[in-house]
Interface confidence: medium
Protein backbone atom coordinates (compact mmCIF):
# COMPACT_ATOMS: atom_id res chain seq x y z
CA UNK A 1 0.00 0.00 0.00
CA UNK A 2 1.38 3.37 -1.02
CA UNK A 3 2.16 5.82 1.75
CA UNK A 4 1.37 9.51 1.74
CA UNK A 5 4.15 12.01 1.24
CA UNK A 6 5.92 13.21 4.34
CA UNK A 7 4.85 16.79 4.96
CA UNK A 8 7.74 19.24 4.93
CA UNK A 9 7.66 21.85 7.66
CA UNK A 10 8.32 24.75 5.31
CA UNK A 11 6.06 23.54 2.51
CA UNK A 12 2.74 25.11 1.59
CA UNK A 13 -0.36 23.05 2.40
CA UNK A 14 -2.73 23.83 -0.43
CA UNK A 15 -6.36 22.79 -0.64
CA UNK A 16 -5.56 19.99 -3.06
CA UNK A 17 -4.03 18.00 -0.24
CA UNK A 18 -4.92 16.58 3.14
CA UNK A 19 -2.47 16.06 5.97
CA UNK A 20 -2.95 13.35 8.58
CA UNK A 21 -0.33 12.16 11.05
CA UNK A 22 2.38 14.07 9.20
CA UNK A 23 1.55 12.47 5.86
CA UNK A 24 0.20 14.37 2.86
CA UNK A 25 -2.53 12.84 0.72
CA UNK A 26 -3.83 14.10 -2.59
CA UNK A 27 -7.43 14.82 -3.46
CA UNK A 28 -9.45 11.56 -3.58
CA UNK A 29 -6.68 9.40 -2.14
CA UNK A 30 -8.02 6.55 0.01
CA UNK A 31 -5.90 5.12 2.82
CA UNK A 32 -6.09 3.15 6.07
CA UNK A 33 -4.43 4.93 8.99
CA UNK A 34 -5.10 1.81 11.06
CA UNK A 35 -6.53 -1.61 10.23
CA UNK A 36 -10.14 -0.90 11.10
CA UNK A 37 -10.35 2.67 9.85
CA UNK A 38 -10.50 3.98 6.30
CA UNK A 39 -10.10 7.57 5.18
CA UNK A 40 -10.46 9.60 2.01
CA UNK A 41 -9.14 13.04 1.10
CA UNK A 42 -12.25 14.84 -0.12
CA UNK A 43 -11.37 18.24 -1.54
CA UNK A 44 -8.94 19.22 1.16
CA UNK A 45 -10.77 17.59 4.06
CA UNK A 46 -10.07 14.18 5.64
CA UNK A 47 -13.20 12.05 6.04
CA UNK A 48 -12.84 8.76 7.91
CA UNK A 49 -15.13 5.86 8.71
CA UNK A 50 -14.90 2.56 10.56
CA UNK A 51 -14.50 -0.59 8.52
CA UNK A 52 -17.54 -2.87 8.97
CA UNK A 53 -16.67 -6.55 8.84
CA UNK A 54 -18.95 -9.19 7.31
CA UNK A 55 -20.13 -11.93 9.63
CA UNK A 56 -18.07 -15.12 9.48
CA UNK A 57 -20.83 -17.56 10.37
CA UNK A 58 -20.28 -21.20 9.48
CA UNK A 59 -16.58 -20.58 9.94
CA UNK A 60 -15.51 -21.41 13.48
CA UNK A 61 -11.79 -21.06 12.74
CA UNK A 62 -11.96 -17.50 11.39
CA UNK A 63 -8.88 -15.43 12.20
CA UNK A 64 -7.83 -11.83 11.72
CA UNK A 65 -4.63 -11.75 9.63
CA UNK A 66 -1.83 -9.56 10.97
CA UNK A 67 -2.34 -5.95 9.96
CA UNK A 68 -5.89 -6.58 8.78
CA UNK A 69 -9.18 -5.71 10.40
CA UNK A 70 -11.67 -8.41 9.51
CA UNK A 71 -11.53 -12.14 10.27
CA UNK A 72 -11.19 -14.53 7.35
CA UNK A 73 -11.77 -18.25 7.09
CA UNK A 74 -8.68 -20.45 6.79
CA UNK A 75 -8.37 -22.05 3.35
CA UNK A 76 -10.67 -25.04 2.89
CA UNK A 77 -12.60 -24.63 6.13
CA UNK A 78 -15.65 -22.93 4.67
CA UNK A 79 -18.94 -24.75 4.47
CA UNK A 80 -20.37 -25.34 0.96
CA UNK A 81 -22.64 -22.37 1.44
CA UNK A 82 -19.72 -20.15 2.30
CA UNK A 83 -17.73 -21.37 -0.69
CA UNK A 84 -20.53 -20.43 -3.04
CA UNK A 85 -20.58 -16.88 -1.76
CA UNK A 86 -16.88 -16.32 -1.15
CA UNK A 87 -15.84 -12.98 -2.58
CA UNK A 88 -19.38 -11.74 -3.06
CA UNK A 89 -19.94 -8.33 -1.59
CA UNK A 90 -22.74 -7.99 0.89
CA UNK A 91 -25.41 -5.34 0.59
CA UNK A 92 -24.11 -1.82 1.05
CA UNK A 93 -25.18 0.23 4.01
CA UNK A 94 -27.14 3.42 3.57
CA UNK A 95 -25.13 6.24 2.05
CA UNK A 96 -24.32 8.94 4.53
CA UNK A 97 -25.43 12.52 3.93
CA UNK A 98 -23.38 14.43 1.38
CA UNK A 99 -21.05 16.77 3.17
CA UNK A 100 -20.23 20.24 1.88
CA UNK A 101 -17.54 20.20 -0.78
CA UNK A 102 -14.28 21.89 -0.13
CA UNK A 103 -11.88 23.04 -2.83
CA UNK A 104 -10.14 20.63 -5.09
CA UNK A 105 -7.06 20.91 -7.12
CA UNK A 106 -5.60 18.72 -9.79
CA UNK A 107 -5.01 15.18 -8.55
CA UNK A 108 -1.45 14.13 -7.90
CA UNK A 109 -0.63 10.44 -7.71
CA UNK A 110 -3.32 7.88 -8.34
CA UNK A 111 -5.37 7.24 -5.22
CA UNK A 112 -4.31 4.38 -2.95
CA UNK A 113 -6.38 1.31 -3.88
CA UNK A 114 -9.27 0.66 -1.53
CA UNK A 115 -9.95 -2.62 0.24
CA UNK A 116 -12.21 -5.09 -1.60
CA UNK A 117 -15.69 -3.69 -1.69
CA UNK A 118 -14.47 -0.08 -1.99
CA UNK A 119 -14.46 1.73 -5.32
CA UNK A 120 -11.00 2.45 -6.67
CA UNK A 121 -9.82 6.04 -7.10
CA UNK A 122 -11.65 7.94 -9.84
CA UNK A 123 -10.00 9.04 -13.02
CA UNK A 124 -9.25 12.64 -13.97
CA UNK A 125 -11.59 15.26 -12.52
CA UNK A 126 -14.61 16.47 -14.40
CA UNK A 127 -18.23 17.29 -13.74
CA UNK A 128 -19.99 16.04 -11.73
CA UNK A 129 -17.92 16.38 -8.58
CA UNK A 130 -16.80 13.46 -6.46
CA UNK A 131 -19.49 11.66 -4.45
CA UNK A 132 -19.61 12.12 -0.70
CA UNK A 133 -18.03 9.42 1.44
CA UNK A 134 -20.48 6.57 2.14
CA UNK A 135 -21.65 5.74 5.62
CA UNK A 136 -20.13 2.27 5.80
CA UNK A 137 -17.37 0.45 4.00
CA UNK A 138 -17.41 -3.28 3.48
CA UNK A 139 -13.97 -4.89 3.49
Amino acid sequence: QEEGQVEGQDEDIPPITCVQNGLRYHDRDVWKPEPCRICVCDNGKVLCDDVICDETKNCPGAEVPEGECCPVCPDGSESPTDQETTGVEGPKGDTGPRGPRGPAGPPGRDGIPGQPGLPGPPGPPGPPGPPGLGGNFAP
Epitope: P14, P15, K45, P100, G102, P125, P127, G129
Partner: antibody, heavy 119, light 107 residues
Framework: EVQLQQSGAELARPGGSVKLSCKAS????????MQWLRQSPGRGLEWIGV????????RYTQKFQGKATLTADKSSSTAYMQLSSLASEDSAVYYC????????????WGQGTTVTVSS | DIQLTQSPKSMSMSVGERVTLSCKAS??????VSWYQQRPEQSPKLLIY???NRCTGVPDRFTGSGSGTDFTLTISSVQAEDLADYHC?????????FGAGTKLEIK
Amino acid sequence: EVQLQQSGAELARPGGSVKLSCKASGYSFTAYWMQWLRQSPGRGLEWIGVIYPGDGDARYTQKFQGKATLTADKSSSTAYMQLSSLASEDSAVYYCARWFHHDYVMDYWGQGTTVTVSS
Amino acid sequence: DIQLTQSPKSMSMSVGERVTLSCKASENVGTYVSWYQQRPEQSPKLLIYGASNRCTGVPDRFTGSGSGTDFTLTISSVQAEDLADYHCGQIYNYPLTFGAGTKLEIK
Protein backbone atom coordinates in the same frame (compact mmCIF):
# COMPACT_ATOMS: atom_id res chain seq x y z
CA GLU B 1 -26.55 35.35 -8.51
CA VAL B 2 -23.13 34.80 -6.93
CA GLN B 3 -21.54 38.07 -5.79
CA LEU B 4 -18.41 38.98 -3.85
CA GLN B 5 -18.46 42.53 -2.52
CA GLN B 6 -15.13 43.85 -1.24
CA SER B 7 -14.49 46.76 1.09
CA GLY B 8 -13.28 50.17 -0.06
CA ALA B 9 -9.80 51.49 -0.72
CA GLU B 10 -7.32 51.71 2.16
CA LEU B 11 -4.45 54.10 2.81
CA ALA B 12 -1.97 52.78 5.36
CA ARG B 13 1.34 53.85 6.88
CA PRO B 14 4.47 51.68 6.58
CA GLY B 15 4.52 49.22 9.47
CA GLY B 16 0.77 49.52 9.91
CA SER B 17 -1.99 47.05 9.20
CA VAL B 18 -5.31 46.90 7.36
CA LYS B 19 -8.24 44.49 7.41
CA LEU B 20 -10.04 43.87 4.12
CA SER B 21 -13.45 42.27 3.82
CA CYS B 22 -15.22 40.22 1.16
CA LYS B 23 -18.97 39.71 1.60
CA ALA B 24 -20.38 36.72 -0.26
CA SER B 25 -23.96 36.27 -1.45
CA GLY B 26 -25.89 34.01 -3.79
CA TYR B 27 -24.34 30.71 -2.67
CA SER B 28 -23.56 28.62 0.40
CA PHE B 29 -20.66 30.58 1.88
CA THR B 30 -19.48 27.76 4.16
CA ALA B 31 -19.25 25.15 1.38
CA TYR B 32 -16.60 26.78 -0.83
CA TRP B 33 -13.04 27.80 -0.16
CA MET B 34 -12.25 31.48 -0.67
CA GLN B 35 -8.99 32.39 -2.38
CA TRP B 36 -7.15 35.67 -1.86
CA LEU B 37 -4.82 37.18 -4.45
CA ARG B 38 -3.16 40.48 -5.15
CA GLN B 39 -2.21 42.33 -8.30
CA SER B 40 0.42 44.98 -8.73
CA PRO B 41 2.03 46.42 -11.87
CA GLY B 42 5.46 45.00 -11.12
CA ARG B 43 4.46 41.53 -10.06
CA GLY B 44 1.19 40.67 -11.84
CA LEU B 45 -1.24 38.35 -10.05
CA GLU B 46 0.05 36.66 -6.90
CA TRP B 47 -1.74 34.01 -4.86
CA ILE B 48 -1.81 34.76 -1.12
CA GLY B 49 -3.84 32.03 0.54
CA VAL B 50 -7.19 30.37 0.99
CA ILE B 51 -9.74 29.83 3.75
CA TYR B 52 -12.55 27.34 4.23
CA PRO B 53 -15.32 29.33 5.96
CA GLY B 54 -17.02 26.14 7.15
CA ASP B 55 -14.36 25.52 9.79
CA GLY B 56 -11.91 28.42 9.49
CA ASP B 57 -9.14 26.28 8.01
CA ALA B 58 -6.71 28.81 6.49
CA ARG B 59 -3.68 28.04 4.34
CA TYR B 60 -1.07 30.44 3.02
CA THR B 61 1.67 30.55 0.49
CA GLN B 62 5.00 30.82 2.24
CA LYS B 63 5.67 34.40 1.15
CA PHE B 64 2.57 35.62 2.99
CA GLN B 65 2.81 33.58 6.18
CA GLY B 66 2.99 36.13 8.98
CA LYS B 67 1.97 38.91 6.61
CA ALA B 68 -1.64 37.87 5.91
CA THR B 69 -4.21 36.44 8.31
CA LEU B 70 -7.42 35.00 6.86
CA THR B 71 -10.64 34.68 8.85
CA ALA B 72 -14.31 34.21 8.07
CA ASP B 73 -17.57 35.10 9.80
CA LYS B 74 -20.26 32.57 8.94
CA SER B 75 -23.08 34.67 10.37
CA SER B 76 -22.45 37.52 7.93
CA SER B 77 -21.01 35.39 5.08
CA THR B 78 -17.92 37.57 5.10
CA ALA B 79 -14.28 36.62 4.61
CA TYR B 80 -11.53 38.85 5.96
CA MET B 81 -7.84 39.32 5.30
CA GLN B 82 -5.67 41.26 7.72
CA LEU B 83 -2.34 42.48 6.38
CA SER B 84 0.30 43.50 8.89
CA SER B 85 3.80 45.04 8.89
CA LEU B 86 2.90 46.84 5.70
CA ALA B 87 5.60 48.10 3.35
CA SER B 88 5.43 50.10 0.14
CA GLU B 89 5.70 46.90 -1.91
CA ASP B 90 2.39 45.76 -0.39
CA SER B 91 0.63 48.50 -2.35
CA ALA B 92 -1.61 46.55 -4.72
CA VAL B 93 -5.17 45.62 -5.58
CA TYR B 94 -6.31 42.70 -3.41
CA TYR B 95 -8.94 40.27 -4.66
CA CYS B 96 -11.06 37.56 -3.11
CA ALA B 97 -12.27 34.82 -5.44
CA ARG B 98 -14.50 31.80 -4.92
CA TRP B 99 -12.80 28.46 -5.56
CA PHE B 100 -15.10 26.16 -7.53
CA HIS B 101 -13.69 22.71 -6.79
CA HIS B 102 -15.81 21.07 -9.46
CA ASP B 103 -13.65 22.44 -12.26
CA TYR B 104 -10.61 23.62 -10.28
CA VAL B 105 -11.17 27.29 -11.01
CA MET B 106 -11.71 30.65 -9.40
CA ASP B 107 -15.07 31.30 -10.98
CA TYR B 108 -16.23 34.51 -9.26
CA TRP B 109 -14.03 37.41 -8.19
CA GLY B 110 -14.64 40.43 -6.00
CA GLN B 111 -14.16 43.87 -7.54
CA GLY B 112 -10.87 44.31 -5.67
CA THR B 113 -9.66 46.56 -2.87
CA THR B 114 -6.84 49.02 -3.52
CA VAL B 115 -4.32 49.24 -0.69
CA THR B 116 -1.82 52.09 -0.79
CA VAL B 117 1.06 52.09 1.67
CA SER B 118 2.65 55.49 1.97
CA SER B 119 4.16 57.71 4.62
CA ASP C 1 7.22 27.51 -8.20
CA ILE C 2 5.88 27.01 -11.70
CA GLN C 3 6.57 29.98 -13.98
CA LEU C 4 4.18 30.98 -16.75
CA THR C 5 5.48 33.10 -19.63
CA GLN C 6 2.97 34.89 -21.83
CA SER C 7 3.66 36.31 -25.25
CA PRO C 8 3.42 38.77 -26.75
CA LYS C 9 3.37 41.35 -23.95
CA SER C 10 0.99 43.49 -25.99
CA MET C 11 -0.61 43.49 -29.42
CA SER C 12 -2.81 45.79 -31.45
CA MET C 13 -5.40 44.20 -33.72
CA SER C 14 -8.24 45.33 -35.96
CA VAL C 15 -11.84 44.25 -35.44
CA GLY C 16 -12.48 40.95 -37.22
CA GLU C 17 -8.86 39.76 -37.10
CA ARG C 18 -7.78 36.45 -35.58
CA VAL C 19 -5.75 36.72 -32.38
CA THR C 20 -3.47 34.06 -30.89
CA LEU C 21 -2.04 34.45 -27.38
CA SER C 22 0.61 32.11 -25.99
CA CYS C 23 1.30 30.85 -22.47
CA LYS C 24 4.30 28.61 -21.73
CA ALA C 25 4.80 26.81 -18.43
CA SER C 26 8.22 26.09 -16.93
CA GLU C 27 7.17 22.49 -16.32
CA ASN C 28 4.41 20.09 -17.28
CA VAL C 29 1.07 21.26 -15.88
CA GLY C 30 -1.16 18.82 -17.74
CA THR C 31 -4.28 20.68 -18.77
CA TYR C 32 -4.64 22.58 -15.50
CA VAL C 33 -4.49 26.04 -17.04
CA SER C 34 -7.15 28.74 -16.97
CA TRP C 35 -7.42 31.94 -18.98
CA TYR C 36 -8.80 35.17 -17.51
CA GLN C 37 -9.90 38.36 -19.23
CA GLN C 38 -9.36 41.60 -17.32
CA ARG C 39 -10.95 44.66 -18.87
CA PRO C 40 -9.65 48.09 -17.83
CA GLU C 41 -10.45 48.90 -14.18
CA GLN C 42 -12.21 45.55 -13.67
CA SER C 43 -11.40 42.33 -11.88
CA PRO C 44 -10.33 39.20 -13.78
CA LYS C 45 -13.13 37.17 -15.36
CA LEU C 46 -12.80 33.46 -16.07
CA LEU C 47 -12.87 32.62 -19.79
CA ILE C 48 -11.35 29.15 -20.18
CA TYR C 49 -10.61 26.40 -17.65
CA GLY C 50 -8.96 23.02 -18.00
CA ALA C 51 -7.01 24.46 -20.97
CA SER C 52 -9.93 24.17 -23.40
CA ASN C 53 -13.28 24.38 -21.60
CA ARG C 54 -15.18 27.59 -22.28
CA CYS C 55 -16.87 29.10 -19.24
CA THR C 56 -20.64 29.60 -19.33
CA GLY C 57 -21.59 32.78 -21.15
CA VAL C 58 -18.23 33.22 -22.88
CA PRO C 59 -18.62 33.84 -26.64
CA ASP C 60 -17.56 30.94 -28.83
CA ARG C 61 -14.99 33.11 -30.62
CA PHE C 62 -12.75 32.37 -27.59
CA THR C 63 -11.00 28.99 -27.82
CA GLY C 64 -8.35 27.49 -25.56
CA SER C 65 -5.99 24.68 -26.48
CA GLY C 66 -2.79 22.98 -25.40
CA SER C 67 -1.43 20.65 -22.75
CA GLY C 68 1.82 19.99 -20.97
CA THR C 69 3.79 23.23 -21.25
CA ASP C 70 2.34 25.07 -24.26
CA PHE C 71 -1.08 26.72 -24.21
CA THR C 72 -2.92 29.01 -26.60
CA LEU C 73 -5.93 31.31 -26.36
CA THR C 74 -7.41 32.12 -29.76
CA ILE C 75 -9.97 34.82 -30.52
CA SER C 76 -11.31 33.90 -33.96
CA SER C 77 -12.69 37.34 -34.82
CA VAL C 78 -11.72 40.03 -32.36
CA GLN C 79 -14.37 42.55 -31.27
CA ALA C 80 -14.02 46.02 -29.78
CA GLU C 81 -15.18 44.75 -26.37
CA ASP C 82 -12.25 42.30 -26.28
CA LEU C 83 -9.91 45.17 -25.37
CA ALA C 84 -8.38 43.80 -22.17
CA ASP C 85 -5.45 42.12 -20.46
CA TYR C 86 -5.44 38.33 -20.76
CA HIS C 87 -3.85 36.25 -18.01
CA CYS C 88 -3.12 32.54 -17.94
CA GLY C 89 -2.91 30.78 -14.58
CA GLN C 90 -1.97 27.27 -13.51
CA ILE C 91 -3.63 25.26 -10.75
CA TYR C 92 -1.56 22.11 -11.27
CA ASN C 93 0.46 22.82 -8.17
CA TYR C 94 0.59 25.29 -5.34
CA PRO C 95 1.27 28.10 -5.07
CA LEU C 96 -1.09 29.03 -7.87
CA THR C 97 0.87 31.12 -10.37
CA PHE C 98 -0.03 33.41 -13.26
CA GLY C 99 1.57 34.82 -16.34
CA ALA C 100 2.37 38.54 -16.55
CA GLY C 101 -0.47 39.00 -19.02
CA THR C 102 -0.93 40.05 -22.64
CA LYS C 103 -2.47 43.46 -23.33
CA LEU C 104 -4.79 43.39 -26.34
CA GLU C 105 -5.46 46.76 -27.94
CA ILE C 106 -7.93 47.42 -30.72
CA LYS C 107 -6.87 49.60 -33.66
